[in-house]
Structure formats: structure tokens, C-alpha cells
């Protein structure tokens, strides 16, 4: 069964800067990745970035840099101040779509006990939705 993992890290140098990494553990080819915060996209979450493997990347503030790390993983750097700044308990969600086979989504937030700049290796997060 395909799985999605999400890793959130606060940068030690900039406390308002977050790095979100997401990956897809499965055999399907990815047609679109959507990254949102505040909950799953389509369920109250706000889209931060959308990545297409061939057509490019779209991103919205406070997203600073979204990119593909591998064919099945992406990273997104957020930086913000004031109202647009993420906080420690912000939930970030990644949805990997493989049209028309299905889509898989998982969410994560900063580990409560983590020090800035330190993070555990990514582990599969609970799958919230699988079509």
C-alpha cells in the first residue's frame, strides 16, 4: 500500500523559517503534489505550493522555495513574519496524486520536543486519504 511521509523542521538560523519535506513510498508515477498548511487541501487548508513533474512549480507566500528532491519527494522552504508566519504547532499536509489511479495525503507538524535545526529521519505519517 502506498504511503506518504511528512517531515517538518524549523531552521536554527531563522526561527520563522520552516522546511517541509514530503515523500511518496509507492510504485506509481506522480502527476501532481500539493502542499498545504492549516489542514488538508480541500478541508480548510491553504495551498502553499503545487508541483508538477513536467510542467513546473507554483507557490504562494510564505512559500519561498519549492523543489523536487527526487522523482517521489519534494521540499518546501517557508519564511514569514507576522500573520503569514507559521508557528510551531502549524499542521502541514502533502498530497501526492497519480491520476487517475489515486491520491494519498498525510500531514505533520513540528515535533513538540524538537530543537531548531534537529529532526528525526522521516517516517511514514498516517495516511489521511486514499482514493
Amino acid at each position: 500500500t502506498p504511503e506518504v511521509w511528512v517531515q517538518v523542521r524549523m531552521e536554527a538560523t531563522e526561527l520563522s523559517s520552516f522546511t517541509i519535506r514530503c515523500g511518496f513510498l509507492g510504485s506509481g508515477s506522480i502527476s501532481l503534489v500539493t502542499v498545504s498548511w492549516g489542514g488538508p487541501n480541500g478541508a480548510g487548508g491553504t495551498t502553499l505550493a503545487v508541483l508538477h513533474p513536467e510542467r513546473g512549480i507554483r507557490q504562494w507566500a510564505p512559500a519561498r522555495q519549492a523543489r523536487w528532491e527526487t522523482q517521489s519527494s519534494i521540499s518546501l522552504i517557508l519564511e514569514g513574519s507576522g500573520a503569514s508566519s507559521p508557528c510551531a504547532n502549524t499542521t502541514f499536509c502533502c498530497k501526492f496524486a497519480s491520476f487517475p489511479e489515486g491520491s494519498w495525503e498525510a500531514c505533520g507538524s513540528l515535533p513538540p520536543s524538537s530543537d531548531p535545526g534537529l529532526s528525526a529521519p522521516p517516517t511514514p505519517a498516517p495516511i489521511l486519504r486514499a482514493d
Epitope: 502527476s31 501532481l32 500539493t34 498545504s36 487541501n41 480541500g42 478541508a43 480548510g44 487548508g45 491553504t46 495551498t47 503545487v50 508538477h52 510542467r55 513546473g56 507554483r58 498530497k95 496524486a97 491520476f99 487517475p100 491520491s103
Partner: nanobody, 121 residues
Framework: EVQLVESGGGLVQPGGSLRLSCAAS????????MGWFRQAPGKGLDEGVA????????KYADSVKGRFTISHGNAKYILYLQMNSLRAEDTAVYYC??????????????WGQGTQVTVSS
């Protein structure tokens, strides 16, 4: 949870018409396009039979221009596809999808289970 539900498919003779409908529920949509995509038996997915973006711009695949018409219902999350002068090569599973525009192309982020359209005498 996002749900897109298609209806209106079926068996029709060549030259006939069908109207597909798509209803979205549980949806707080932040994408910028919706459309109809299809997959014929044993073939790959069509890039987009007919799509419409939030600005109302409509795009049709060359193979359906002048025969198919995409439109929204009274609500933003109702989508229709009027298919006229149907041909055997239109036989496929038709998917309603919502997504994001890249380079003028609508890329699906959410979609329904699909509805079968068969054109045969």
C-alpha cells in the same frame, strides 16, 4: 473529504448525444481549473477533453472541438459536458477533475471515479 461524482454516461449510437454531469461535495476548493478527462480502453489518459479555469477560459482538445461543450451549473461546483455527434473513438471512461493550471493545461488534483461512455451501433 473531497468527492467528485460523475453521472450521465452510457451506451449511445454514433451521431448521438450525451450530457455528463459532475457534482462536488465536501469541498473547499483552492484550485483554479476544472475539466473533463478521458481514458480509452488500452490507451493512455487524454490531456484534457475540455477544461475551464476560474477566469472562465475554456479549452477543448482538437478532437472534440465543435462537438463537445463544457459549462458550469448554477453553482461553481457543478460541471457539465454536452457531447454531440459522438463517434466510436469517443468511447472511454470520462473523469471529472479539479486542479491547477500549468502552462495553460489543467492538471488534476482531485477527480471522480469516472463514468463509462460507449459509442457503438
Amino acid at each position: 473529504e473531497v468527492q467528485l461524482v460523475e453521472s450521465g454516461g452510457g451506451l449511445v449510437q454514433p451521431g448521438g448525444s450525451l450530457r455528463l454531469s459532475c457534482a462536488a461535495s465536501g469541498y473547499s476548493y483552492s484550485g483554479d481549473c476544472m475539466g473533463w478527462f478521458r481514458q480509452a480502453p488500452g490507451k493512455g489518459l487524454d490531456e484534457g477533453v475540455a477544461t475551464i479555469d476560474n477566469a472562465g477560459r475554456i479549452k477543448y482538445a482538437d478532437s472534440v472541438k465543435g462537438r463537445f461543450t463544457i459549462s458550469h451549473g448554477n453553482a461553481k461546483y457543478i460541471l457539465y459536458l454536452q457531447m454531440n455527434s459522438l463517434r466510436a473513438e469517443d468511447t472511454a471512461v470520462y473523469y471529472c477533475a479539479a486542479g491547477w493550471t500549468f502552462g495553460g493545461q489543467c492538471s488534476p488534483a482531485d477527480w471522480g471515479q469516472g463514468t463509462q461512455v460507449t459509442v457503438s451501433s
